[in-house]
C-alpha cells in the first residue's frame, strides 16, 4: 500500500487583488479514509479556510468534484482576493475517527503573496 503524500506544487503563489487564486493540492493515495481540509497558518492561530463537510465558505470553490469516490484533487479557488488573504495555505488530510477525525498529514504549504498590479 502506497504511503499518502500531500502535494502542493507551488511554494509561492503571486496573486492580484480582485482576481481569483487557485491553490493546488493533490494526494497520491485514497487511504486512509477521511477528509482533506484547507487551513491558513500553523499553530494556535491556524485558520480554517475550507471544509467540504461543514461551514460556509462563500469565496471558496473546489476545482474538482470532491464527492467523486476516486477524487485525488483537492485544489481550491479563492475569489475576489484582498490584501488580507496573504499567508501560507496548507491542505491537510484527516483520518476518519470517532468521535473526531484525526490529523494525518499536511502538505508543505503554499505562500500566497500579492504580485504587482497589471499595468
Amino acid at each position: 500500500e502506497e504511503e499518502l503524500q500531500m502535494i502542493q506544487p507551488e511554494k509561492l503563489l503571486l496573486v492580484t487583488v480582485g482576481k481569483t487564486a487557485t491553490l493546488h493540492c493533490t494526494v497520491t493515495s485514497l487511504l486512509p479514509v477521511g477528509p482533506v481540509l484547507w487551513f491558513r497558518g500553523v499553530g494556535p492561530g491556524r485558520e480554517l479556510i475550507y471544509n467540504q463537510k461543514e461551514g460556509h465558505f462563500p469565496r471558496v470553490t473546489t476545482v474538482s468534484d470532491l464527492t467523486k469516490r476516486n477524487n485525488m484533487d483537492f485544489s481550491i479557488r479563492i475569489s475576489s482576493i484582498t490584501p488580507a488573504d496573504v499567508g501560507t495555505y496548507y491542505c491537510v488530510k484527516f483520518r476518519k475517527g470517532s468521535p473526531e477525525n484525526v490529523e494525518f498529514k499536511s502538505g508543505p504549504g503554499t505562500e500566497m503573496a500579492l504580485g504587482a498590479k497589471p499595468s
Epitope: F39, G41, V42, P44, G45, E47, L48, E103
Partner: antibody, heavy 116, light 108 residues
Framework: VQLVESGGGLVQPGGSLRLSCTAS????????MSWVRQAPGEGLEWVSA???????YYTDSVKGRFTISRDNSKNTLYLQMNSLRAEDTAIYYC???????????WGLGTLVTVSS | EIVLTQSPGTLSVSPGERVTLTCRAS??????IAWYQQKPGQAPRLLIY???SRATGIPGRFSGSGSGTEFTLTITSLQSEDFAVYYC??????????FGGGTKVEIK
C-alpha cells in the same frame, strides 16, 4: 467582533473553575481562540489556545491542570481550570488569534482569585 | 522559549514628544513581532503586527520597525490618550507565544 468572558470568581487553592467566552461578529469555528492572563500589577501571559482545526495548546505551567475546549454551535470557548494555585490569580482574557499567531481582538476579561 | 525584553520599564514624557520603545528578542524572530497598548482597567489593543504593519483603525503616529532581534515602537507626537502600558509579543514561535514585560509611558 465581540468577546465576552464569564465564570471568574473566588476559589480556594486546589479548587476548580470554568471560564466561558462567548463570541460574535465572526465565523467562530474557523478561527483560533486563546486565553491570556494578567496577574495583578503584572504583564501578559499566554495560557492556552484552540486552533481553527481544534488542536489545543498550553503553556507549561498549566499543562495537566487546565483544559481548553470550544462549542462551535454556541460560539463559545471554555477554560476548565483544576488544581488551582495562588499564582493562577489573574484577569483572564479571551482573545481571537490571527492565522499568524497574534491577537487581534480581546474581551474585557474575567477575574479569577485563588485564595483561602 | 523566546524571551522578550522591553526597555525602558517606565518612560516619563510630555504630550507632543516623540517616544521610542524597544523590544529585544533572545533569538531571531524574522520580524514576527506585535505591539499592544493597554490602558488601566482595559483589555490590550493591537497596534502593530509583523513588526511594521499597523492594525485597523490605529492612527498614523504609531509606527513599528526593526528586524532580527531588535524592534521599536515609535509614537511621533504623544497624545494624552497614548499614556498607557505597551507590550510586545513574538508571533514567530508558538510554543509558547510570549510577551515582553511591558513599558509604562507616563506623564512627565
Amino acid at each position: 467582533v465581540q468577546l465576552v468572558e464569564s465564570g471568574g470568581g473566588l476559589v480556594q487553592p486546589g479548587g476548580s473553575l470554568r471560564l466561558s467566552c462567548t463570541a460574535s461578529g465572526f465565523t467562530f469555528r474557523n478561527y483560533g481562540m486563546s486565553w491570556v492572563r494578567q496577574a495583578p500589577g503584572e504583564g501578559l501571559e499566554w495560557v492556552s489556545a484552540s486552533s481553527g482545526s481544534g488542536s489545543t495548546y498550553y503553556t507549561d505551567s498549566v499543562k495537566g491542570r487546565f483544559t481548553i475546549s470550544r462549542d462551535n454551535s454556541k460560539n463559545t470557548l471554555y477554560l476548565q481550570m483544576n488544581s488551582l494555585r495562588a499564582e493562577d490569580t489573574a484577569i483572564y482574557y479571551c482573545a481571537k488569534v490571527t492565522w499568524n499567531n497574534f491577537f487581534d481582538y480581546w474581551g474585557l476579561g474575567t477575574l479569577v482569585t485563588v485564595s483561602s | 522559549e523566546i524571551v522578550l525584553t522591553q526597555s525602558p520599564g517606565t518612560l516619563s514624557v510630555s504630550p507632543g514628544e516623540r517616544v521610542t520603545l524597544t523590544c529585544r528578542a533572545s533569538q531571531g524572530i524574522a520580524g514576527k513581532i506585535a505591539w499592544y497598548q493597554q490602558k488601566p482597567g482595559q483589555a490590550p489593543r493591537l497596534l502593530i503586527y509583523d513588526a511594521s504593519s499597523r492594525a485597523t483603525g490605529i492612527p498614523g503616529r504609531f509606527s513599528g520597525s526593526g528586524s532580527g532581534t531588535e524592534f521599536t515602537l515609535t509614537i511621533t507626537s504623544l497624545q494624552s490618550e497614548d499614556f498607557a502600558v505597551y507590550y510586545c509579543q513574538q508571533h514567530y514561535d508558538w510554543s509558547p507565544l510570549t510577551f515582553g514585560g511591558g513599558t509604562k509611558v507616563e506623564i512627565k
